[in-house]
């Protein structure tokens, strides 16, 4: 015979072909193998021109043989070289699907690998691919697109072998909160690491506002709006500055009243206030909390403490804001310019988590009074806020 | 209208007890802390007790620190003072009053009082 | 415990006169001060809350100024039923303690 050829190789297959001898013969004797595998002969009729060569190992070397028989004649003998196909990793399956991240898995193929290459593509034509070591049989995916319908394959390679790509499709499922209007509602939404989140206020998505999710104390969910912990910001400043809010929301900074008004307008929120000087922590938690509009010089409530570190706040209940440059106080003088702070102050305080960073003074100072007193300026203070009902909220999410 | 009654004073023996009573009215008793104050017949006042809108928090003066108990049920607006191992300085007119907002504040209501005598 | 002294203990003066009475404290109390009335046979009357707020109520010639440790109420035109003992009283800590009281009497 002449003109031996392979057709269609795959990963476990081959068709092999070639021209018939001129003269007639009795049969064919075709042999492959491959390094690592064994010889296999096969005998064929003499009038047949091609053979399915079966039972192939994936991604290797193969040299097939092929001579004609006639009575005891033999042939010379012809040889091809072809190399299967490099067989592809199985079962790829996406499982723990959330909103945002999804583990894949997949069983390697027979050949060994150097590699795989993970592509997976969203319904509006995103495309990510990764390429991930040849020991790799599982994948996170992160920051997906919730309610959205996503096509995952898989490719496994060899050098500059490529196998056939398999594939898988799931779809995330939907935020619980497409819009969260606070923490809590991010946090329910599965995101569980402190830091800045972007919130709607009223869930309107033209009302954004980045915020800081405090999402480990006391289970979580929520906003900061004021913190304290190295002097670095002033806060002795005017009513402009404290309405609108300042200061760099991963440090010290105030949310600014005009944001908590819209915020605790939303619905019944609670306050925590967490204290922390010289290794030593307080905390004082309001079951009711709201900071009224700017007609009402953002009126302050305050109800239902609990805690450690004092029910210091009742005392400033029901007052308006005051600021060096807007005195509501119910003070001769002006409470904001004797203590170098805001606060929605009386006469004065007991309560001035934004007075003067570091200052011992009397009264001037980060003080708690139930907690430090007067002559001692906290090193770390943050107020924060959450819905009233977050543990019912909570509680319906992990039934969910 | 806001309404303060104390009731439970009378003449005592030292070494005994004596408990008082403070009927509240007019106003969210459970929003508010309330105290006890004291006045000696014919000398000034003199803070006793007092305890937070909850009843979770309670303060005393140095002297009835260990004998005088206060307490309050919010249900039916009341406030208390047991009174042990009375001693004849306790001899005074007991006022109950209400703390205008938070828990040491000005009293801006006070009841009529009733009186202890401590005497053998 | 913080000390309250109030000054004089005692004074005599007619209607219509202006009468002043001083407090202070032992120690710096901010704004933490109110001042009481008290007639004979009758429980106090709160009258001025953290050191210059009106009670709702009571009249217009009762003032009330000061801050820190020093304090005044002032009487601007004496009256008849102004006749009685006035007490100050510090709510900055406990235990709350009041002054020894000032009485005005008819001169």
């Known amino acids: 015979p002449s003109g031996l050829v392979t057709a269609n190789i795959t990963d476990s297959e081959a068709l092999a072909r070639w021209q018939p001898a001129i003269a007639t013969v009795d049969s064919y004797v075709i042999s492959y193998t491959g390094e690592k595998v064994p010889e296999i002969t096969r005998t064929v009729s003499g009038n047949t021109v091609e053979y399915a060569l079966t039972d192939l190992e994936p991604a290797t070397e193969y040299t097939l043989r092929i001579f004609a028989e006639k009575g005891p004649q033999k042939s010379s003998t012809i040889t091809a070289k072809f190399t299967t196909d490099l067989d592809s990793p199985r079962d790829l399956t996406a499982t723990e699907v959330q909103s945002e991240t999804a583990l894949l898995t997949w069983r390697p193929p027979r050949a060994s690998v150097t590699g795989y290459l993970l592509v997976y593509e969203s319904v509006d034509g995103t495309v990510k691919e990764v390429i991930v070591g040849p020991d790799t049989t599982s994948y996170s995916l992160a920051d997906l697109s919730p309610s959205t319908h996503y096509t995952a394959k898989i490719q496994a390679l060899n050098g500059p072998l490529r196998s056939n790509m398999i594939q898988t499709i799931f779809t995330t499922i939907g935020l619980l909160y497409p819009f969260p209007k606070d923490c809590s509602q991010a946090m329910l939404n599965g995101d569980t690491t402190s830091g800045l989140y972007t919130i709607y206020l009223n869930g309107d998505k033209a009302e954004a506002l980045e915020v800081f999710c405090d999402m480990t104390s006391d289970g979580g969910g929520w906003i900061v709006f004021l913190r304290r912990k190295n002097g670095r910001e002033n806060f002795y400043q005017n009513w402009k500055a404290y309405a609108a809010g300042f200061g760099d929301r991963r440090e010290e900074f105030w949310l600014g009243l005009d944001n908590l008004n819209k915020i605790t307008a939303q619905g019944q929120y609670e306050l925590r206030v967490d204290l922390r000087d010289h290794g030593e922590t307080a905390f004082a938690v309001y079951d009711k909390f709201s900071v009224g509009d700017a007609k009402t010089r953002y009126k302050l409530k305050v109800e239902g403490y609990s805690g450690t570190a004092g029910d210091s706040m009742a005392y400033h209940n029901g007052r308006s804001f005051s600021t060096f440059d807007k005195d509501t106080d119910s003070a001769i003088t002006n409470c904001a310019l004797s203590y170098k702070g805001a606060f929605w102050y009386r006469n004065c305080h007991r309560v001035n988590l934004m007075g003067r960073y570091g200052d011992n003074n009397h009264s001037q100072g980060v003080n708690w009074f139930h907690w430090k007193g007067h002559e001692h300026s906290i090193q770390f203070a943050e107020m924060k806020l959450r819905p009233s009902n977050f543990r019912n909220l909570e509680g319906r999410r992990k039934r969910a | 209208q806001v309404q303060l009654v104390e009731s439970g004073g009378g003449l005592v023996q030292p070494g005994r007890s004596l408990r008082l009573s403070c009927a509240a009215s007019?106003?969210?008793?459970?929003?508010?802390?309330m105290h006890w104050v004291r006045q000696a017949p014919g000398k000034g006042l003199e803070w006793v007790s007092g305890i937070s809108g909850s009843g979770g928090s309670t303060y005393y003066a140095d002297s009835v620190k260990g004998r005088f108990t206060i307490s309050r049920d919010n249900a039916k607006n009341s406030l208390y003072l047991q009174m042990n191992s009375l001693r004849a300085e306790d001899t005074a007119l007991y006022y109950c009053a209400k703390s205008y907002q938070s828990d040491e504040d000005a009293f801006d209501i006070w009841g009529q009082g009733t009186m202890v005598t401590v005497s053998s | 415990d913080i000390q309250m002294t109030q000054s004089p203990s005692s004074l005599s003066a007619s209607v219509g006169d202006r009468v002043t009475i001083t407090c202070r404290a032992s120690q710096y109390i901010q704004g933490f001060l109110n001042w009481y009335q008290q007639k004979p046979g009758k429980a106090p009357k709160l009258l001025i809350y953290?050191?210059?707020n009106l009670e709702t109520g009571v009249p217009s010639r009762f003032s009330g100024s000061g801050s820190g440790t020093d304090f005044t109420l002032t009487i601007s035109s004496l009256q008849p039923e102004d006749f009685a003992t006035y007490y100050c009283q510090q709510s900055y800590s406990t235990p709350q303690t009041f002054g020894q009281g000032t009485k005005v009497d008819i001169k």
């Open positions: 953290d050191a210059s």
């Open positions: 007019g106003f969210t008793f459970d929003d508010y802390a």
